[in-house]
């Protein structure tokens, strides 16, 4: 999916009224120090296509963060404020029903909602410069 | 079973402002969002605007932004929709309709409409 | 804005009769078109969503294709119960739209 048309502002006011504070409370009890961050994005559409990816797919020793909250309202702000893209779901929505798993909060987990959060932060403060 | 029940027929004097209700019941409120559309006599369907009360907020079409307002009372699991300045042509039937939002994407229960009538 | 526009505006049509009716979009929509029926005192019944998946309850006779710009509803074999306004709809972009209505009357 190219995310090159999506409404970004109205994405950013979900993140900052919302869904970063579900990233803070999955977060609580972990040092943000705990984790660096190895997952960048350079553009707006760049960032949504890496959170979408770090947040709908599971990866090896994190196969759970699709149901939690944050996800859901990712979700929904993606399938909201992106042209066409609830289209894309229709399928996956379906697919996922099938492989649905016990929510299960492992480190893996926890490290890729702190690159997560990189992303989002990186997302809201598109004119900076990559470092 | 999904049900979409809003409140009964308006009349109103133009210049004033009404509100629609639309008390859902049988599916999880914060699952789906709430849009408006309405309907004037003998015309086709207009899309007002949606509640999302999963990321509590609004959003509307420009047609009718300043002048409609979009909530909801996740509580009692009731949406909203006011409309202000009303003017003749704003008689019709609004319509509240439910859409998922992290699945289905798409207007699948609708309420039974509430005729508002614009008139001096 | 997108713009849908249906059409015929009315097709009469005789009980068993096949209908056929066409919307088409003022932009590139993918599959992101969903189909109404409306009777007269009634609210929009969905028929079809994201132009081609059918809803559970709604008669197999109810199909629908296409994408891109073009889409069609077909009802094979028309019931009676059927003869109803249909509406098109957009959920691509905000905001949505829909389409004039196609009349499906008695012949």
């Known amino acids: 999916y190219d995310f090159t048309n999506c409404d970004f502002e109205k994405i950013k006011a979900a993140y900052l009224s919302t869904i970063s504070k579900d990233l803070i409370t999955y977060m609580s009890g972990t040092k943000s120090t705990e984790f660096n961050n190895t997952v960048s994005c350079s553009n707006r559409p760049h960032c949504l296509t890496e959170i979408q990816s770090l947040t709908f797919n599971p990866t090896a020793g994190c196969a759970s963060l699709a149901k939690e909250m944050f996800a859901m309202k990712t979700k929904a702000a993606l399938a909201i404020w992106c042209p066409g893209y609830s289209e894309t779901q229709i399928n996956a929505t379906q697919a996922m029903k099938k492989r649905r798993k016990r929510k299960v909060t492992t480190n893996k987990c926890l490290e890729q909602v702190s690159q997560l959060q990189g992303l989002w932060r990186r997302f809201n403060r598109p004119l900076l410069k990559q470092q | 079973q999904v049900q979409l029940v809003q409140s009964g027929p308006e009349v109103k004097k133009p210049g004033s402002s009404v509100k629609v209700s639309c008390k859902a019941s049988?599916?999880?409120?914060?699952?789906?969002?709430m849009h408006w559309v309405r309907q004037r006599p003998g015309q086709d369907l207009e899309w007002m605007g949606t509640?999302?009360?999963?990321?509590?907020?609004?959003d509307y079409n420009q047609n009718f932004k300043g002048r409609a307002t979009i909530t909801a009372d996740k509580s009692t699991s009731t949406a909203y929709m006011e409309l202000s300045s009303l003017r003749s042509e704003d008689t019709a039937v609004y319509y509240c309709?439910?859409?998922?939002?992290?699945?289905?994407?798409?207007?699948?229960?609708w309420g039974q409409g509430t005729l508002v009538t614009v008139s001096s | 804005e997108i713009v849908l526009t249906q059409s015929p505006g009315t097709l009469s049509l005789s009980p068993g009769e096949r209908a056929t009716l066409s919307c088409r979009a003022s932009?590139?929509?993918?599959?992101?078109v969903h189909w109404y029926q409306q009777k007269p005192g009634e609210a929009p019944r969905l028929l079809i969503y994201?132009?081609?998946q059918s809803i559970s309850g709604i008669p197999d006779r109810f199909s629908g294709s296409g994408s891109g710009t073009d889409f069609t509803l077909t009802i094979s074999r028309l019931e009676s119960e059927d003869f109803a306004v249909y509406y098109c709809?957009?959920?691509?972009?905000?905001?949505?739209?829909f389409g004039r209505g196609t009349k499906v009357e008695i012949k």
């Open positions: 309709a439910r859409m998922g939002v992290t699945h289905s994407y798409v207007m699948d229960a």
């Open positions: 049988g599916y999880i409120f914060t699952d789906y969002a």
């Open positions: 509640f999302i009360p999963l990321l509590d907020t609004s």
């Open positions: 932009q590139h929509i993918s599959r992101s």
């Open positions: 994201f132009a081609s």
């Open positions: 709809q957009q959920s691509y972009s905000f905001p949505y739209t």
